[in-house]
Interface confidence: medium
């Protein structure tokens, strides 16, 4: 239904707290360099204006679209051109082009320092002094670093943050209470960020139809007892919600997500028997819980999929008459029977089925042609299954750090032209798949591994798009989203690469490395490993292991030495010489 004032409507639906949080996220995601104070001022102005519209929907400007209102606010910021360069050109455009222009200028890798967590005491002091400002800073800092973070979900993480601080700041040992809990939230939020970015990429590159197919597969796995009409309704609504968030329409997105959660909880009987626990929670927790609810028990009496999609004599007629619906029901039926497959795999199978029908239905004897289609799925299913087995075996053997190093070597060989920081970030993220997925029960491993890897590789593609340097990466990133992971897995050593010359300074270290936190130490060592591979792309695993063991021993020795600086300056050059010899 149309409202006289869109901003008043959203303010009323969302309430002041969520309204302000979402406006802050929106501004922080659009203008990523502005300070918290600058954005907080704008948010207050927008909120005050929304209140005047709530009081009188006919008041001046209350009938304007949210894009117009928000865009006008952003364009009124002083020194926009000095701080944001060509983004200021967006302000010469009219809506909807202006908003599209803002979206195109979102930076997936902004040059901002890492978000450092303050000391426990300092954190608790500022949280107690002003919880609202403290949480505002959190929203601002996360949103500007992750310009596609799913806004209603970021509100959920802020709420988690708030609850942890409330609990831990009352404890005697604040540090040991806060650290593991906040680390947990951070890890989950980072995964949420890459997953959502993948959804926005899907929407941006391949449109709503591609996202809806993803949603049908995912929802059918989770709700195998829901009928196709129900799944389609949920997929359509979920597509709308994600389209809005990816498009920067955060108020509409959060409002529609709340509506979807309400609908699901009111229709549990036709959706799933597993929703009640989620539905008992307050809004943000409820929506979050529903998004990762466990799979419902599969119906016991599902007939073989072949009956309707292979053996039926009307397959080609049915397909020709309404292709999307026919393929949609195939995807629904296959997915509800396979919670043990990744969504990417299910979409590849649906694509294979579609290609088979396109080919076979044009032939003289279609049933003879498409009769073997299910058997032809086998290699497509085996490939990711083997990937999971091989990688989980390697993870169990090496542990997370060693597994990350193995992946780093592999990916540096595949795409040595990619910048070392990007390779290290990618390998560290890809390597976490072991900890995240390999400890799960067998039937949950494949969906966990492949869908997580796909999301990480999407980030690799986004970063590479900014400065394309590797033909290998460009090839894999240009294809469809569901083919990316198999494409990257199939890449081998890039034979076109001219090895980097050996620079001693790349492998020169100083005593300051000794005081770094463990994570930073690992990154330094992994940076050196990537550089070694760039120098010797065909070095054997054994050679690299020798060098890295020597390097670790060197760090250990010098960091324990009484005179660290002398140790580094005398032993460092010896290490470099030994490395060169080992790789010769």
């Amino acid at each position: 239904e149309a409202h006289k004032s869109e901003i008043a409507h959203r303010y009323n639906d969302l309430g002041e707290q969520h309204f302000k949080g979402l406006v802050l996220i929106a501004f922080s995601q659009y203008l990523q360099k502005c300070s918290y104070d600058e954005h907080a001022k704008l948010v207050q102005e927008v909120t005050d204006f929304a209140k005047t519209c709530v009081a009188d929907e006919s008041a001046a400007n209350c009938d304007k679209s949210l894009h117009t209102l928000f865009g006008d606010k952003l364009c009124a910021i002083p020194n926009l051109r000095e701080n944001y360069g060509e983004l200021a050109d967006c302000c010469t455009k009219q809506e909807p082009e202006r908003n599209e222009c803002f979206l195109q200028h979102k930076d997936d890798n902004p040059s901002l320092p890492p978000f450092e967590r303050p000391e426990a005491e300092a954190m608790c002091t500022s949280f107690k002094e002003n919880p609202t400002t403290f949480m505002g800073h959190y929203l601002h800092e996360v949103a500007r670093r992750h310009p596609y973070f799913y806004a209603p979900e970021l509100l959920y993480y802020a709420e988690q943050y708030n609850e942890i601080l409330t609990q831990c700041c009352a404890e005697a040992d604040k540090e040991s209470c806060l650290t593991p809990k906040l680390d947990g939230v951070k890890e989950k939020a980072l995964v949420s960020s890459v997953r959502q970015r993948m959804k926005c990429s899907s929407m941006q590159k391949f449109g709503e139809r591609a996202f809806k197919a993803w949603a049908v597969a995912r929802l059918s796995q989770t709700f195998p007892n829901a009928d196709f009409a129900e799944i389609t309704k949920l997929a359509t609504d979920l597509t709308k919600v994600n389209k809005e968030c990816c498009h920067g329409d955060l108020l509409e997105c959060a409002d529609d997500r709340a509506e979807l959660a309400k609908y699901m909880c009111e229709n549990q009987a036709t959706i799933s028997s597993k929703l009640q626990t989620c539905c008992d929670k307050p809004l943000l927790k409820k929506a979050h819980c529903l998004s990762e609810v466990e799979h419902d028990t599969m119906p016991a009496d599902l007939p073989a999929i072949a009956a309707d999609f292979v053996e039926d004599q009307e397959v080609c007629k049915n397909y020709a008459e309404a292709k999307d619906v026919f393929l949609g029901t195939f995807l629904y039926e296959y997915s509800r029977r396979h919670p043990d497959y990744s969504v990417s795999l299910l979409l590849r199978l649906a694509k294979k089925y579609e290609a088979t029908l396109e080919k076979c239905c044009a032939e003289a004897n279609p049933p003879a042609c498409y009769g073997t289609v299910l058997a032809e799925f086998q290699p497509l299913v085996e490939e990711p299954k083997n990937l999971v087995k091989t990688n989980c075996d390697l993870y169990e053997k090496l542990g997370e750090y060693g597994f990350q190093n193995a992946i780093l070597v592999r990916y540096t060989q595949k795409a040595p032209q990619v910048s070392t920081p990007t390779l290290v970030e990618a390998a560290r993220n890809l390597g976490r798949v072991g900890t995240k997925c390999c400890t799960l029960p067998e039937d949950q491993r494949l969906p966990c591994v492949e869908d997580y890897l796909s999301a990480i590789l999407n980030r690799v593609c986004l970063l590479h798009e900014k400065t394309p340097v590797s033909e290998h990466v460009t090839k894999c990133c240009s294809g469809s989203l569901v083919e990316r992971r198999p494409c990257f897995s199939a890449l081998t050593v890039d034979e076109t690469y001219v090895p980097k010359e050996f620079k001693a300074e790349t492998f020169t270290f100083h005593s300051d490395i000794c005081t770094l936190p463990e994570k930073e130490k690992q990154i330094k060592k992994q940076t050196a490993l990537a550089e070694l591979v760039k120098h010797k792309p065909k070095a054997t695993a054994e050679q690299l292991k020798t060098v890295m063991d020597d390097f670790a021993q060197f760090l250990d020795t010098c960091c324990k030495a009484a005179d660290k600086d002398t140790c580094f300056s005398t032993e460092g050059p010896n290490l470099v010489t030994r490395c060169k010899d080992a790789l010769a």
Epitope: D227, A229, T232, E333
Partner: nanobody
Framework: QLQVVESGGGLVQAGGSLRLSCAAS????????MGWFRQAPEKEREFVAG?????????DYADSVEGRFTISRDNAKNTAYLQMNNLKPEDTAVYYC????????????????????WGHGTQVTVSS
């Protein structure tokens, strides 16, 4: 939620014809078998005719209407039809359209339990 609306009922002389329509609110309607049922005063609701998804696919009729009634569907319009010819006084009833929630592509069932989306009905009266 999928909405189903019947229309086309009315009063007709014995031997006459009527065409009932059943409009569904969503495109996904085409992925389901659908059926027509009827309920005469003081009687149980009974199966009349059914059609599986997609035109040209399986149709099924109750013995009492075989040869006189024809069920069809227009997927582009999200609409199904029941063409009723040579009507008899015993065809007088409220006619209901229903959409199945069984396996999409499955055969139309005669059992009321296999249909989950129902319209409110349209009255058909055949006078002698």
């Amino acid at each position: 939620q999928l909405q189903v609306v019947e229309s086309g009922g009315g009063l007709v002389q014995a031997g006459g014809s009527l065409r009932l329509s059943c409009a569904a609110s969503e495109r996904t309607f085409v992925a389901y078998p659908m059926g027509w049922f009827r309920q005469a005063p003081e009687k149980e609701r009974e199966f009349v005719a059914g059609i599986s998804w997609f035109a040209g696919a399986t149709t099924d009729y109750a013995d009492s209407v075989e040869g006189r009634f024809t069920i069809s569907r227009d997927n582009a319009k999200n609409t199904a039809y029941l063409q009723m010819n040579n009507l008899k006084p015993e065809d007088t009833a409220v006619y209901y359209c229903a959409i199945s929630h069984q396996l999409p592509g499955g055969r139309p069932g005669r059992d009321m339990d296999s249909y989950s989306y129902w319209g409110h009905g349209t009255q058909v009266t055949v006078s002698s």
